[in-house]
Interface confidence: low
């Protein structure tokens, strides 16, 4: 069977696959996925290895019409370096000489200057070029190579290995050489794979069942460390609870050097965030950190300094901590649409079972703002998802110069942020450089501010506007607000109006219904529009909503019903696959993801049209 890195090299024009008959004869044959001689894989950024011979494709010289054969893999050889050129051409690196089928007289695969159909190759069974199954460096654990990547193939006791092996070991642990010649260099590490005993590479917290892996002997950049964790279905460490920090302080107490964790400020204009998307709600900075020096965007935990955190340049080479298993976050379920009554009092706006209101004009210190919200039957707003934040920004009349209290604060426990309404912290979106929580300023409360509505900590005694939120009431008729530029019953977002079509319809019927409304089945231009639509339909009880995407016109090419390029996709797993059809958005757990359905299935749908007289706020005078 093919493993996921292996592939057959297929020429569509001849409908045949490359076959390594021997190291000196690389020819073609009828494709056979069980034939070892037809299996290849990338073993570096630019080398392709024959699985059967554990030798690499190469040429004797970079000249036209020479035979491509197999050579001992040498990562330094210019004659073994391949690259995908435009479309499905495979060429020797740095030259316009291509991997070519040969001809009637020449059965061997050749290097040739021509770029026609005989020089075009795909992965068998797909429409992808060979680079789509590219090389992924595998970072080692423990061993003696400082976490360096596996070098495939590597030689051990004069035998070549193209995969991790337990050869030479009685414990069954999988290892690899980190240079091509282990026999000479003796450099190795264990592979980040599941094997008998690999669990002992992890420490499990008995209280939370979360596992941690301390790689103190490695020397990787932050991005490499993150990749290493991800290769083990884990992530760089996030710390969201005080208990978790205490446990890790104990776990690392015997170490002295810094270890990468997942905290970073790599987003261009938002603040500190965890790489596993946990909320940044607990702070444990080293005094003087985070320093504001540019480039210091990644964070290490300092075992020698009571496991406190320090921001460093991401290219520094350090050890690192991975984390996997149950998240330390409390589970928190957003109510499903069937639990979401829509009635809100006048001047309050409904979203997912709650009502929201901005108080902009009556400025109050945080404590008084909280009191007012509670008197009105609610609380200062909590925010649990990007969709909820997007709703507040785009639908509540939020303005870019607003600075408004939300319910997040660390009044009860310093450096540990909580929502005033008692709901768990599942999401944060801090402004660049935030939370600053400078020691000389008691910044225990949190505001939303700036064009994006991102968050900053602030002294609680400032008089500011605020946002209240309360559970919506089920009684009473639904209030349908008419949004400016949209007809009654339509919802506005940016330049457009949207409406849910409530009649179960085929794709064609849905399209016609939208057209009758001087609209069209929705297009989705980018992930912001997708986030809006996910919040619009994602919590509804129906399973699918038609979009305007289909490959009815040209099989295999998905197009919108209007003349709009497809510049963004949000496919569900295994989609679009090879089946033709029409595209609908999922609801529920897979909310917003796109599935291909038969076009005559019946589903609800979303119509869209340009808002009337779309205009922006007047340009500010400078």
């Amino acid at each position: 069977l093919l493993d996921t890195r292996q592939f057959l090299i297929y020429n569509e024009d001849h409908k045949r696959c490359v076959d390594a008959v021997s190291p000196s004869a690389v020819q073609t044959a009828a494709c056979n996925q069980d034939a070892e001689s037809q299996k290849f894989r990338w073993v570096s950024e630019s080398q392709i290895m024959s699985v059967a011979f554990k030798l690499c494709l190469g040429v004797p010289s970079k000249t036209d019409w020479v035979a491509i054969t197999l050579y001992a893999c040498d990562s330094k050889s210019e004659f073994q370096k391949w690259e995908c050129k435009n479309d499905t051409l495979l060429g020797i690196k740095g030259e316009d000489l291509f991997f070519n089928y040969g001809n009637r007289q020449e059965k061997n695969i050749m290097l040739y200057k021509g770029s026609g159909l005989w020089s075009r190759w795909k992965i068998y069974g797909t429409t992808d070029n060979l680079c789509s199954r590219g090389y992924e460096a595998m970072y080692t654990l423990l061993g003696n190579a400082n976490g360096a990547t596996c070098a495939f193939p590597f030689k051990f006791e004069n035998k070549w290995y193209a995969d991790c092996t337990s050869a030479g070991r009685s414990d069954g642990w999988l290892w690899c050489g980190t240079t091509t010649d282990y026999d000479t260099d003796k450099l190795f590490g264990y592979c980040p794979l599941k094997f008998e005993g690999s669990e002992s590479l992890w420490n499990k917290d008995p209280l939370t069942s979360v596992s941690y892996q301390i790689n103190s002997k490695s020397a990787l950049t932050w991005h490499q460390a993150r990749k290493s964790c991800q290769q083990q279905n884990a992530e760089l460490l996030s710390i969201t609870e005080i208990h978790e920090q205490t446990y890790l302080t104990g776990l690392t107490s015997s170490l002295t050097s810094g270890l990468w964790i997942g905290l970073n400020s790599l987003s261009f204009n938002s603040g500190w965030q965890w790489s596993d998307r946990s909320p940044f709600r607990y702070l444990n900075w080293l005094p003087g950190s985070p320093s504001a020096e540019p480039g210091k965007s990644c964070v290490s935990l300092n075992p020698g300094k009571n496991a406190k955190w320090e921001n460093l340049e991401c290219v520094q080479k350090l050890g690192y901590i991975c984390k996997k298993g149950n998240t330390t976050l409390n589970s928190f379920v957003i109510p499903s649409e069937s639990d979401v009554p829509t009635h809100c009092p006048s001047q309050w706006w409904p979203y997912a079972g709650h009502c929201y209101k901005i108080h902009r004009d009556e400025k109050k210190i945080q404590r008084d703002a909280l009191t007012t919200c509670r008197k009105e039957g609610g609380d200062l707003t909590s925010i649990h998802t990007i969709e909820e934040l997007d709703f507040i920004i785009s639908q509540l009349g939020y303005e870019p110069n607003d600075e408004l209290w939300i319910g997040l604060n660390d009044i009860k426990i310093q450096m540990y942020f909580e929502w005033s309404d008692g709901t768990p912290v599942t999401f944060t979106k801090w402004l660049r450089g935030e939370p600053s929580h400078e020691n000389n300023r008691q910044e225990d409360c949190v505001v939303m501010k700036g064009k994006d509505g991102y968050w900053a900590d602030r002294g609680c005694e400032w008089p500011l506007g605020y946002i209240c939120k309360m559970k919506s009431r089920s009684q009473g008729p639904e209030i349908v607000e008419v949004e400016k530029g949209c007809r009654k019953g339509w919802k506005k977002h940016h330049f457009y109006c949207y409406m849910i079509g409530h009649t179960l319809s085929t794709f064609a019927e849905a399209n016609q219904t939208c057209n009758n409304e001087n609209a069209y089945l929705t297009t989705i231009e980018d992930r912001y529009e997708q986030a809006f639509l996910t919040s619009f339909v994602g919590l509804r009880p129906e399973k699918y909503f038609w979009t305007g995407l289909s490959d009815i016109q040209t099989k295999g090419t998905f197009q919108w019903t209007i003349e709009e390029e497809v510049r963004f996709t949000h496919w569900n797993s295994d989609m679009p696959g090879r089946k033709p059809g029409c595209v609908a958005m999922r609801t529920g757990i897979a909310g917003g993801l796109w599935d291909v359905l038969k076009c005559d299935e019946k589903a609800k749908f979303v119509c869209k049209h340009w808002a009337e007289g779309v205009t922006h706020p007047p340009k500010p005078t400078t």
Epitope: S267, F268, N269, H494, R567
Partner: nanobody, 121 residues
Framework: QVQLQESGGGLVQPGGSLKLSCAAS????????MGWYRQAPGKQRELVAA???????NYADSVKGRFTISRDNAKNTVYLQMNSLKPEDTAVYYC???????????????WGQGTQVTVSS
Amino acid sequence: QVQLQESGGGLVQPGGSLKLSCAASGSIFSIKTMGWYRQAPGKQRELVAAITSGGSTNYADSVKGRFTISRDNAKNTVYLQMNSLKPEDTAVYYCNADGVVAWDQPYDNYWGQGTQVTVSS
């Protein structure tokens, strides 16, 4: 920050043509909708035409059939071809773009400084 630079404005006779250009520069990650607005003296700013990155267009009723908006995504540039110009088209024309400066940021709205179009005999 994203900057928008308009050009192509000027004085033209009724029935004449002009082509406005607007180029976006600066730390752009992606630009979604680009458009033209205009503001005549003493009047509110109004949408003239807009175009999405995918090529979908929208026009004010008063310019349909006379003005054509187009866009070069590679150059982050939008054009407004104005034909059969009328005196009532006289205004300052502003370029507008919904841009984003990083992959995980919401769109922000940007304006150019404006270019004067005068239609008069």
